[in-house]
Amino acid sequence: HNTTVFQGVAGQSLQVSCPYDSMKHWGRRKAWCRQLGEKGPCQRVVSTHNLWLLSFLRRWNGSTAITDDTLGGTLTITLRNLQPHDAGLYQCQSLHGSEADTLRKVLVEVLADPLDHRDAGDLWFPGESESFEDAHVEHSISRSLLEGEIPFPPTS
């Protein structure tokens, strides 16, 4: 899986989208988890409604919400009031039994507000780009990690 980068601004909200094949994942609940270390487990943050037919209902855990468009095949995660500690590697998952398929690996980057430090909380709706050149920091965007890029900074 390539890793897609979503950039958001601290104190604002970020929407992460994870497209998937709606037929292949028909009837499956979805989840959003946080990767603990480069090879560590993925810790569940929030999952969609227990009843698959009600997956469109937003479910919250703290300030993170998940909602699933099961017909269109798009899982949407909202990180409301983004904070620096939200930065890191995450996964969108499709659940079946005790197993989980990875739909998308996501690197969330949190930027300082370049516009107005008094103004907390702008909603940015990320578009997606596949190259680093398109990753303009004045917008909340997403891109795929280039080959060789490391999602976790080296630790000493």
Epitope: L57, R59, L123
Partner: antibody, heavy 124, light 107 residues
Framework: QVQLQQWGAGLLKPSETLSLTCAVY??????YYWSWIRQPPGKGLEWI?????????NYNPSLKSRVTISVDTSKNQFSLKLSSVTAADTAVYYC??????????????????WDQGTMVTVFS | EKVMTQSPATLSVSPGERATLSCRAS??????LAWYQQKPGQAPRLLIY???TRATGIPARFSGSGSGTEFTLTISSLQSEDFAVYYC?????????FGQGTKVEIK
């Protein structure tokens, strides 16, 4: 059909604490943020703050030092406390749901359901 | 916070005529803007969200447009029940903020 109904004291003296509770009937309580909004007589609307079922809150900075919003998920209720009230806090207080759901475009954080409001008067 | 400014404060219009209400944001709110209608003694009612999408049950004579900092609510042919106060509100950031309102009255 989602309905909101609130109650609380309508007459207060300066320095007392305003206390209101809003009950949510029908729909999914856990899918939304729930807000308090007020309107002084003959004036415009002012957002006070919001909470979700997890207890996550956001407050208006102009009132933050005096406001506490709490939630009771077992009863599908959320409450507002505003301390040290003055005559300037005289207003109609509304509770509202934040999060209009559009089947095509998902959730929009507009206030789509309101209660009828409670008039709170602060008098000396 | 983002300041929302509505104009005019009062709009006098005859029934059947078109009414155009304006709302300006101090900074961009993208399309995260709603319009509400409020009649005396009642709670506000959501008319428009996402700057241009009508809420369920809102008549087609109400339309919204704009993005960024400039927004417009248009009532194509005013009916007697449309005379009220209209508020714009941004939900792009915290705190949520409303305009001061435009009163649409009978001319």
């Amino acid at each position: 059909q989602v309905q909101l109904q609130q109650w609380g004291a309508g007459l207060l003296k300066p320095s007392e604490t305003l206390s209101l509770t809003c009950a949510v009937y029908g729909g999914s309580f856990s899918s939304y943020y729930w807000s308090w909004i007020r309107q002084p007589p003959g004036k415009g609307l002012e957002w006070i703050g919001e909470i979700n079922h997890s207890g996550n809150t956001n407050y208006n900075p102009s009132l933050k030092s005096r406001v506490t919003i709490s939630v009771d998920t077992s009863k599908n209720q959320f409450s507002l406390k505003l301390s040290s009230v003055t005559a300037a806090d005289t207003a109609v207080y509304y509770c509202a749901r934040e999060g209009y759901y559009d089947i095509l475009t998902g959730y929009h954080d507009a206030f789509d359901i309101w209660d009828q409001g409670t008039m709170v008067t602060v008098f000396s | 916070e983002k300041v929302m400014t509505q104009s005019p404060a009062t709009l006098s219009v005859s029934p059947g005529e078109r009414a155009t209400l304006s709302c300006r944001a101090s900074q961009s709110v993208n399309n995260n803007l709603a319009w509400y209608q409020q009649k005396p003694g009642q709670a506000p009612r959501l008319l428009i969200y996402g700057a241009s999408t009508r809420a369920t049950g809102i008549p087609a004579r109400f339309s919204g447009s704009g993005s960024g900092t400039e927004f417009t609510l248009t009532i194509s042919s005013l009916q007697s029940e449309d005379f009220a106060v209209y508020y714009c509100q941004q939900y792009n950031n915290w705190p949520r903020t409303f305009g001061q309102g435009t009163k649409v009255e009978i001319k």
